[in-house]
Each structure stands twice: as C-alpha cells, then as structure tokens.
C-alpha cells in the first residue's frame, strides 16, 4: 500500500513539476528591466527565451520574437536546449510512468516489469528536473554577470549621440517557476526510484529436497525454479541438476525407506 502511495505521489509531483517546466519555458518574464526617467511614458521591458516585450504605463504591451539565431548569446541557446531536453525527458518519463503505476493493470504485466519502468521513469524525472534547474541557473548567472547594471556610457556617432539607458535587470517570475518546477520534478523522480525498490519482488530460493532414484547419482532439485525478478542469475528458470546428492543447504541426504523412485 505504501509503495503504491509513494509511486502515485511521485507521479503527481513529477506531473506538476513538468507542467511547471513547460510553463517556465514559455513564459516571457525570464528577465525584467525597468527603463527609468522617460518623460513620455514609463516603459517596462521583460524578456523570455523566445521573445522580448515592452509594456507601457498605459497598459499597452508589444512583444517581438527573436527571429534570428545569430544575434542571440550562446548561453541563451544553451538554456533553450536544456529546457527543451528537460521537457522531452519529462514527457517520456510521464508516459512510461503511467504504464508503470501499480494501480493500473495492463494485460499480464509482471511486477518486475513495472519495477523496471518505475525506475526508468524515476531516472528520467531526475534528469529532467536537473536540466530545468541547470537551465534556470545558467540564465540567472548570465543576468548577474552580464546584464545586472548597464553603465550609462555616452559616445557620438554619425547619427548624433547615443546614451546607453541606465537599466537594472532583475530575475523574472519564470526563473522562480523554473527552479520550483525543476525541484518538484526531481523530488518526484526520487520518489519513483524509492517506489521501484518496493515494487521489485524479493528473490526467493525455496528449500530444495533431493529425490534419489535408486541406482542413479543424479538428484533433481525443484528449488531450481526461482521466483525471478529479472535481476537474478537464473533468469531463464532453467532446471538445475546436480551430480551430488545434496540440498541447497549442503546437507547430505541419505536414502531411506521413505525415498520414492
């Protein structure tokens, strides 16, 4: 029961996490920027992974997509890649984990197969969460190192004068959504991995009793059939024959009047 609850909770937490990663990736508020001291209108700029938006004090908002790859920083491309990999892995993990859920019966799927699928999905969730956390952290670091405060430098060119606007870049809401979502996906993945241990049946070796045929030295051991999880050495359930007349406990069994041929 506890295993089913752990697996189910892990699935739900991961589902919420991956939804959050998708939301964060699509959001425009990865970095926000206040443009101060403009007498015409207060302008608020915010940028995402895919487009840049400007909102005026009147409420009017205009967004423009990044339709070029050349003018974008390599770090931004790396963040995009990390987030997309996180989403893809998470989506595959969700698909696998649906079939792995103990409460869902699909044909005659064994617990060992479900255990393997649960472990696989758990690892996928962990990697997905790490990708999201890494992506968001790389972006945050990029903001801190490169864009935190642009200096107000002036220079004159052919078209007159240009002055870099004194701006302050701050972390946008998407960063916090991404961090939390990545963490949830990671936690969900760990829970799935924990649930996997409970799903895997114990490898049971039944006590073997030797049956001796008179005049033969071959003992047939029924214990050769193991309850296999797929991880044991005797995965093909082969019958085990032993030349000696011994049990699996290495206790010598001698013929008696109760032996059957």
């Amino acid at each position: 029961m506890a295993v089913t609850a752990c697996q189910g909770l892990g699935f739900v937490v991961s589902l919420i996490g991956i939804a959050g990663i998708i939301a964060a990736t699509c959001m425009d508020q990865w970095s926000t920027q206040d443009l101060y001291n403009n007498p015409v209108t207060a302008v608020f700029n915010y940028q995402g992974l895919w487009r840049s938006c400007v909102r005026e004090s009147s409420g009017f908002t205009e967004c423009r997509g990044y339709f070029t790859l050349l003018g974008l920083p390599a770090m931004l491309q790396a963040v995009r890649a990390l987030m997309i990999v996180g989403i893809v892995l998470g989506a595959i993990g969700l698909l696998v984990s649906i079939f792995a859920l103990k409460c869902i019966r699909i044909g005659s799927m064994e617990d060992s197969a479900k255990a393997n699928m649960t472990l696989t999905s758990g690892i996928m969730f962990i990697v997905s969460g790490l990708c999201a956390i890494a992506g968001v952290s790389v972006f945050a670091n990029m903001l801190v190192t490169n864009f935190w405060m642009s200096t107000a430098n002036m220079y004159t060119g052919m078209g007159g004068m240009v002055q870099t606007v004194q701006t302050r870049y701050t972390f946008g809401a998407a960063l916090f959504v991404g961090w939390v979502a990545g963490g949830l996906t990671l936690i969900g993945g760990v829970m799935m991995c924990i649930a996997c241990r409970g799903l895997a049946p114990e490898e049971t070796n039944y006590k073997a009793v030797s049956y001796h045929a008179s005049g033969h030295s071959v003992a047939y051991k029924p214990g050769g059939f193991k309850a296999s999880t797929g991880f044991g050495s005797n995965t093909k359930n082969k019958k085990i024959y032993d030349g000696g007349a011994r049990t699996e406990d290495e206790v010598q069994s001698y013929p008696s009047k109760h032996d059957y041929v």
């Epitope: 443009l35 015409v40 209108t41 302008v43 840049s52 009147s58 974008l72 078209g159 870099t164």
Partner: nanobody, 121 residues
C-alpha cells in the same frame, strides 16, 4: 549602426506651419518611444512632444493644441506637425528615440543631429 536623420526644418513666418520628420535606420529590433526635443539659444534642452508604440503622447505645455506628434511604426519614422508657429518656437529640434538594436540586449537613448527651425516675426 543606428542613425536618426531629421528633416523638414527651415525659415517660416509667425503663424505659419512646418512638418518635421525623423527616420531611424540601421539595425533596429524595437523602438518603444520616439520624441522631439528642442534647444533654443541660451536655454536648456526641453521635451516638445513624445509618442510611444502604443500611441501614448506627451506634449510640453507651451505647444499643446498647436503641435501634433505622430509616428509610422512600419517605417520607424516620427513626425511633428507644427502649426501657429511663434518666434518663441525658434530652436534646433532634435529627434530622440529609445531603441533596442539587438533582440537580446539593452536599450539605447539615440539622438539625431538636429534641424534648425526659425520663426520670423
């Protein structure tokens, strides 16, 4: 490199009209605000009128009702229609734009070289 080029200035009689235009050219990703400033001899530079992409406008009290600012977003151009001109309006008129050159980058406050407007009495 971004350039702002003003045109339309000249000598005009008091009560007359002029239409100034300013074109922003070069590598431009976004221009949220385009404005006109002026500097009269011996005075500080002052805002005449400004317009945002969304159509928000702001005028100096001295020109309200006489000047009209407009812009063509597709052409990255701003216009200043000046009617009922007075000798006090004599100044060098500068075009100013808040421009983002690259998709990912900071905004720059760009200025044109100015066009002279002289109103004779």
């Amino acid at each position: 490199e971004v350039q702002l080029v003003e045109s339309g200035g000249g000598l005009v009689q008091a009560g007359g009209s002029l239409r100034l235009s300013c074109v922003a050219s070069g590598s431009i990703f976004h221009i949220p605000i385009m404005s006109w400033y002026r500097r009269a001899p011996g005075k500080q530079r002052e805002l005449v009128a400004g317009i945002s992409t969304g159509g928000s406008t702001n005028y100096a009290d001295s020109v309200k009702g006489r000047f009209t600012i407009s812009r063509d977003n597709a052409k990255n151009t701003v216009y200043l229609q000046m009617n009922s001109l007075k000798p006090d309006d004599t100044a060098v008129y500068y075009c100013n734009s808040l421009i983002k050159e690259e998709a990912w980058g900071t905004f720059g406050d760009y200025w044109g070289q100015g066009t002279q407007v002289t109103v004779s009495s």
